[in-house]
Interface confidence: medium
């Protein structure tokens, strides 16, 4: 059964999905789709990564975490009731039938209506407003093969040097996580 996540209309929704790349420069393609994960690929793809980049996205959908360290959690900006439903995060591990598939259920609740306060107070939005003028991913020509391996010393150095990403333990525990390599 799907893990359920909730957001209110007008907020940003966050759907966690993680994996651990064998090395920071050796990514596994990931796709996000609207609808349960099919046998292959993702249906109704909203975002896709390849071995190096986010190479396709649609308006309002983006990865705010450090996807090159395996945080491929999906952010949906300014959700509406129509965004409710099942979403598929698919870690496309090379090999036949090796993919890891995670179905996440998003439930959108109507925005809370609160009585007007008797005096005005400062209000800070919980989510910053993002520009979403893009409707599709970048146009590029690619031929991609296996990407670089990094030795253990480099991985250790990278782990020490790179900024802590959003792969916090509590998020990792609440989302889909898979170890690659």
């Amino acid at each position: 059964s799907e893990v359920e996540y909730r957001a209110e209309v007008g907020q940003n929704a966050y759907l966690p999905c993680f994996y651990t790349p064998a090395a920071p420069g050796n990514l596994v393609p990931v796709c996000w789709g609207k609808g349960a994960c099919p046998v292959f690929e993702c249906g109704n793809v909203v975002l896709r990564t390849d071995e190096r980049d986010v190479n396709y996205w649609t308006s309002r959908y983006w990865l705010n975490g450090d996807f090159r360290k395996g945080d491929v959690s999906l952010t949906i900006e300014n959700v509406t009731l129509a965004d409710s439903g099942i979403y598929c995060c698919r870690i496309q591990i090379p090999g036949i039938m090796n993919d890891e598939k995670f179905n996440l259920k998003l439930v959108i609740k109507p925005a809370k209506v609160t009585p007007a306060p008797t005096r005005q107070r400062d209000f800070t939005a919980a989510f910053p407003r993002m520009l979403t003028t893009r409707g599709h991913g970048p146009a590029e020509t690619q031929t991609l093969g296996s990407l670089p391996d990094i030795n253990l010393t480099q991985i250790s150095t990278l782990a020490n040097e790179l900024r802590d990403s959003r792969l916090a333990n509590d998020l990792r525990d609440s989302g889909a996580t898979i170890r690659i390599g």
């Epitope: 190479n55 996807f67 991913g137 590029e140 991609l144």
Partner: antibody
């Protein structure tokens, strides 16, 4: 120490091709991406594409699709960028830049630049 | 393509003063932003990677911050050798794009 040494300045006529080389030393050439970036006179930086020397995988900026080709010679640790059908607005300094040690996607070492002038 | 817009285009600041250069992406790029310094006649030099990580050997007066669409390069106390053009770059998705540059001068 890491060094990227590029070939010398070139003067070409419109419609011609240019091939710029970038010889790498001081690190394992096949372990890092090599990107190419150009800078027109008095202008900003523009990304042309990258090549991963280990397997020859490339990605090109769509703007240059069909005109640019990136190759490597692993035996000499040299990367090449060829730009064809040159136009006057291709006049620029062309840089090779190594994808970084801490981040493969930003450039920690740059070549000294190769000035390409396209003029009739 | 993702457009990176820097502000201001140029600025003049007194030695020892704090400098702030902003960069805005046309869509969210997470933390996939680098900052470069380019002095006249030289190749660019990496200052900051992944938005906030100072590259090896870069003086600690340089710092980067931001995530999503808004990024900032800060020089806490301007030195004479910091006169240069500064560029932000997104590497979230290719084609990787740079800001138009910010020229920093001494007042």
């Amino acid at each position: 120490q890491v060094q990227l040494v590029q070939s010398g300045a070139e003067v070409k006529k419109p419609g011609a091709s240019v091939k710029v080389s970038c010889k790498a030393s001081g690190y394992t050439f096949t372990d890092y991406y090599m990107d190419w970036v150009r800078q027109a006179p008095g202008q900003g930086l523009e990304w042309l594409g990258y090549i991963y020397p280990n397997n020859g995988g490339t990605s090109y900026n769509q703007k240059f699709k069909g005109r640019v080709t990136m190759t490597t010679d692993k035996s000499t640790s040299t990367a090449y960028m060829e730009l064809r059908s040159l136009r006057s607005d291709d006049t620029a300094v062309y840089y090779c830049a190594r994808g970084g040690y801490y981040s493969y996607y930003s450039y920690d070492y740059w070549g000294q630049g190769t000035t390409v002038t396209v003029s009739s | 393509d993702i457009v990176m817009t820097q502000s201001p285009d140029s600025l003049a600041v007194s030695l020892g003063e704090r400098v702030t250069i902003n960069c805005k992406a046309s869509q969210s790029v997470g933390n996939n932003v680098a900052w470069y310094q380019q002095k006249p006649g030289q190749s660019p030099k990496l200052l900051i990677y992944y938005a906030s990580n100072r590259y090896t050997g870069v003086p600690d007066r340089f710092s980067g911050s931001g995530s999503g669409t808004d990024f900032t390069l800060t020089i806490s106390s301007l030195q004479a050798e910091d006169v240069a053009v500064y560029y932000c770059q997104q590497h979230y998705s290719s084609p990787y794009t740079f800001g138009q540059g910010t020229k920093l001068e001494i007042k």
